[in-house]
Structures are given as C-alpha cells and as structure tokens.
C-alpha cells in the first residue's frame, strides 16, 4: 500500500512494514504508525515496546549510569536493565543512586549478609 | 476536502482554564494520531501535545505537562486542548493539525489564547 | 530533545533568485521524519516537504528537499514573489517533535 492511497496529501515514502494493528494495537517490539495502517519495528538498542499498543513512538532505552553496569541490553522488546557497580547498591527509597556499601559491621555487630546490588551488608548483635 | 476548525480561545487570567475544540471533517478521524501546535506572537512555532488515533496514547512537551490534557472524541470528530493553571508565557495562536511524526499535512487556521490580567 | 538549528536567520533574494535554507539536527535524525513548511504573516503553516524529499500535494516543483542524517537542505530554484514567508523544518524521529527556529525569506 503506497501513502497515496491512504492520504491524499503525502505520496509514498519508504518506511519499515511490518504487519496490520490487530484491534487498533501493535504487538510488543512495535508501534502503531500515524494512520493507524501499520505496525512499524522499534530500533534494536535504541527503542522498546513491551506489550500491545497504539504508541506512535517506541520507548527510548535506558542508558546505565557511571557506576552502573548493563546486566542486560535494551531489546525491541525489552528494557536496558542496569545494576549497580560491585561494592555499590540501590535502595528503594532512593533508586536514582548506587550508594557504597558498609565495608563492616560495627563493633559488637557481625556481618549476617554481604553486600549486593540490592542491599548494603547486613549486620546483627553478637549474642554474649 | 479535509477541514479542521478550531474553537474556545479567549482571554483568560492566569492561573485560569480554557478548553479548546478542533473539529475534523473529510478525512477518517479515527485513524489519524492529531496535534495541537502553538505560536507565541512574533515567535516560532512550538508543538504543544498529540494523541493517538484511538486516544490510548497522548503526549506532552514538558512545558504544558501536568497542565493541559488533549483528548478526542472519535464519534464526534474532534480533537481537544484542556488548559489549566494557565500562564502568561502560555499566549499563543493555538493550531490543530493532522499528524505528528511524518509531517502535519493539514492544519486548523488557529485560535488566539490570551492568558492575562 | 533533538534541536534543530536554520540558517541562515533571514535570506534577502530577488524574485528570480535561487535560495537555499539549512536544518542542521543535534542528533541524526531518519529521513522519513523530516518535514518543511512555509508560513505567511496571519496564516497556518503549510507542509511543502515531508519525508525530507517528498513534495506534499499541489507544491510547485521549484520546492525540493534534500539531505539525511543531521543536515538538510530545502532548495527554491526561482523565487516567485509569494514565495516570500517564513520556512520552517521540523522533526519526528523522537519525541518531542520539534521545529527549527525559522528562516525568513524576504524580498533584497
């Protein structure tokens, strides 16, 4: 199908195809195109979709920060995903940040957890 | 012969809210992502949010985010600006166009949105 | 966001003349998502090219487009006298859609 058809202001330009909306939605690693004729690919490594959709521009991919390392690469269809550097961690309350780990436990208190990309060492009480 | 025709500028005080309306005729509505794009007096022009042809997906430029919601009606054919907490740097002639990414090949012929005191 | 940036700011041509006005984008932008308008004082916009090339309906061939990447180039062979306006290039290749600044062609 050429854009003539479809618009009688713009003439065909090339364009990925990939497949027909199915019910007015792409599937995942697409986006729907303006007149809603067409499913178009996102860019691997640059953008993402990750479920069915009417979006008219894929997700753009997360890039890890310094101190972060790429666990896993931003697909068409799925998300970079970044985890903090070893000896750092993110807590929840503030997940924009890799906060460095207690190197150890103060004194009374014993190491129970070493530190991951999750959580920041974890000590107890020594019993007497 | 496609037309979009735009409607609800005025003069508001800031802080104030206005609606506007862009109706569509003489293309299918509901299959077309639309926009709204502005121009402040003298200025260039500035897009200002967009929606998909099913309304399931919209998007703001950071400017208006959190303030003004597009949204479309597809069984009237027509396409609408909710303004809120208006500013001053919100004047502007405000355009409904068709499209978004591959060019806005049809345009309303705008409406003036005074934001004042 | 991608930034596009025109020149030169104002082109002073004769009717006759041949102009050309430059969109240099911050970040590659595809072809397929470039697009020119032309503007007169008190009117919409109007899209003269899209897909960085492609004439929309009802342009004169006087008006091409051309380039890729991060430099595109709309080209007027002759300037007819209501070909002075303001010219836009615009983009969508990533959200925000965004316009260059406009370059202003009038009458030297």
């Known amino acids: 199908i050429t854009r003539q058809s479809l618009d009688p202001q713009r003439r065909a330009a090339p364009q990925q195809k990939r497949s027909s909306p199915t019910e007015g939605l792409c599937p995942p690693g697409h986006h729907i195109s303006e007149d809603s004729r067409e499913c178009i690919s996102c860019k691997y490594g640059q953008d993402y979709s990750t479920h069915w959709n009417d979006f008219l521009f894929c997700l753009r991919c997360t890039k890890c920060d310094s101190g972060e390392v790429e666990v896993n690469s931003c697909t068409t269809t799925r998300n970079t995903v970044c985890q903090c550097e070893e000896g750092t961690f993110r807590e929840e309350d503030s997940p924009e940040i890799c906060r460095k780990c207690r190197t150890g436990c103060p004194r009374g208190m014993v190491k129970v957890k070493d530190c991951t990309p999750w959580s920041d060492i974890e000590c107890v009480h020594k019993e007497s | 012969e496609v037309q979009l025709l735009e409607s609800g500028g005025g003069l508001v005080q800031p802080g104030g809210s206005l609606r506007l309306s862009c109706a569509a005729s003489g293309f299918t509505f509901s299959s077309y992502a639309m926009s709204w794009v502005r121009q402040a007096p003298g200025k260039g022009l500035e897009w200002v949010s967009a929606?998909?042809?099913?309304?399931?997906?919209?998007y703001y430029a950071d400017s208006v985010k959190g303030r003004f919601t597009i949204s479309r009606d597809n069984s009237k054919n027509t396409l609408y600006l909710q303004m809120n907490s208006l500013r001053a740097e919100d004047t502007a002639v405000y355009y409904c166009?068709?499209?978004?990414?591959?060019?806005?090949?049809?345009w309303g012929q705008g409406t003036l949105v005074t934001v004042s005191s | 966001e991608i930034v596009l940036t025109q020149s030169p700011g104002t082109l002073s041509l004769s009717p006759g003349e041949r102009a050309t006005l430059s969109c240099r984008a911050s970040?590659?932008?595809?072809?397929?998502?470039l697009a020119w308008y032309q503007q007169k004082p008190g009117q919409a916009p109007r899209l003269l090219i899209y897909g960085a090339s492609s004439r929309a309906t009802g342009i004169p061939d006087r008006f091409s487009g051309s380039g890729s990447g991060t430099d595109f180039t709309l080209t007027i062979s002759r300037l007819e006298p209501e070909d002075f306006a303001v010219y836009y290039c615009q983009q969508g290749e990533s959200p925000p859609p965004t316009f260059g600044q406009g370059t202003k062609v009038e009458i030297k």
């Open positions: 166009a068709k499209g978004v990414r591959k060019g806005f090949d049809y």
């Open positions: 970040q590659s932008v595809s072809s397929s998502y």
């Open positions: 929606i998909s042809g099913s309304g399931g997906s919209t």
